[in-house]
């Protein structure tokens, strides 16, 4: 029979691959059906019978066409500093991402393994580089003529107000104080905020033609305490 009309299981012609959504079973030496996402191989194929697939049990999944004997376990529930952006279903693992005000200090294939709070720049320091999904805030000292009087992960250094008559000169952590009732500003008053990083990640995953039969292992790297960076608060 030509390959196009053969039913699984069948022996492929020498030098030919199996067809779409099939795999070559080394034991049976036959092309057999794969199991669809959300299923696993309950019984492997033989020379005379095709693969028997069964649905994944609760809290387990398979995302790809496969012939694995057991479904993969969904990851543990998201921690308090995370939000669940994709639920555990029979076809996909749970994905946890960092909640606003946090960034991913240790990522995994999808989502985040360990979140950390975004650094807050203390007075006299402003945000040089805002935090992102995967990187912390970078603080810098306010340059002469600018200040920041807040402890914030979003505020940048702002220019001192320009006084007709200065009562108290400004410094890195305090604005100038004017005696005149009509100071002028080179910028609009009020704190300048940088946008918070968005903590959602793309959910799109690419299927691969030959899914691995080995379950993925997850682990936590030991994270010792680290001193706060210059210009940041430890909280």
């Amino acid at each position: 029979l030509p390959a196009q009309v053969a039913f699984t299981p069948y022996a492929p012609e020498p030098g030919s691959t199996c067809r779409l959504r099939e795999y070559y079973d080394q034991t049976a030496q036959m092309c057999c059906s794969k199991c669809s996402p959300g299923q696993h191989a309950k019984v492997f194929c033989t020379k005379t019978s095709d693969t028997v697939c069964d649905s994944c049990e609760d809290s387990t999944y398979t995302q790809l066409w496969n012939w694995v004997p057991e479904c993969l376990s969904c990851g543990s529930r998201c921690s308090s500093d995370q939000v669940e952006t994709q639920a555990c279903t029979r076809e996909q693992n749970r994905i946890c991402t960092c909640r606003p005000g946090w960034y991913c200090a240790l990522s995994k294939q999808e989502g985040c393994r360990l979140c950390a709070p975004l650094r807050k720049c203390r007075p006299g320091f402003g945000v040089a580089r805002p935090g992102t999904e995967t990187s912390d805030v970078v603080c810098k000292p306010c340059a002469p003529g600018t200040f920041s009087n807040t402890t914030s992960s979003t505020d940048i250094c702002r220019p001192h107000q320009i006084c007709n008559v200065v009562a108290i000169p400004g410094n890195a952590s305090m604005d100038a104080v004017c005696t005149s009732t009509s100071p002028t500003r080179s910028m609009a008053p009020g704190a300048v905020h940088l946008p918070q990083p968005v903590s959602t990640r793309s959910q799109h995953t690419q299927p691969t033609p030959e899914p691995s039969t080995a379950p993925s292992t997850s682990f936590l790297l030991p994270m010792g305490p680290s001193p706060p960076a210059e210009g940041s608060t430890g909280d």
Epitope: G15, T17, R19, L64, P209
Partner: antibody, heavy 119, light 107 residues
Framework: QVQLVQSGAEVKKPGASVKVSCKAS????????INWVRQAPGQGLEWIGW????????QFNENFKGRVTMTTDTSTSTAYMELRSLRSDDTAVYYC????????????WGQGTTVTVSS | DIQMTQSPSSLSASVGDRVTITCRAS??????LNWYQQKPGKAPKLLIY???KLHSGVPSRFSGSGSGTDFTLTISSLQPEDFATYYC?????????FGGGTKLEIK
Amino acid sequence: QVQLVQSGAEVKKPGASVKVSCKASGYTFITYDINWVRQAPGQGLEWIGWIYPRDGNTQFNENFKGRVTMTTDTSTSTAYMELRSLRSDDTAVYYCARGDRDYGYFDVWGQGTTVTVSS
Amino acid sequence: DIQMTQSPSSLSASVGDRVTITCRASQDISNYLNWYQQKPGKAPKLLIYFKSKLHSGVPSRFSGSGSGTDFTLTISSLQPEDFATYYCQQGNTLPLTFGGGTKLEIK
């Protein structure tokens, strides 16, 4: 980034053979099928077949069986497609494309190789 | 072989328009329907696979629907870069086959 780079244009006489190459980079070459698809001038797309680089096994469109040979060189991550007994209606742009055997799609394409068959 | 028939073969539209292209298979192909975009002198690009899954990097204005034998590609709000030829392709059965294409032109 993931890319497929093909060899240059060819002009052949009827009855001759042509061999087109496709060099892959940016991914693990042996884990994805390399498909060959052609497009005649002003026409649609026609699937020729695929090769699985890990073992060199192939799957062909019956319309091309006996006239086409697909091979790979895993040391250079290069796939080759040879078409024999060329006819004028084989004039086309030949593309290599990385394929997914579960959903039957082509997610990365080469830039195409123009093959002109003319006496 | 499974025949794939696209309609219309050509279509004129304006930037901002909502556009629909249809693809019909000669037999049931479940959800194994893929869509590609091709610009003159360039290779096709995968837009959608398995009827409605958006390939990475493809704008969300593209969407796919249907099942069995009748499928639709929709562009919710046409952008200048969307004027191209679109092909459907079935991934259900060998040989893999394509539709004849729909050329989307500026009105």
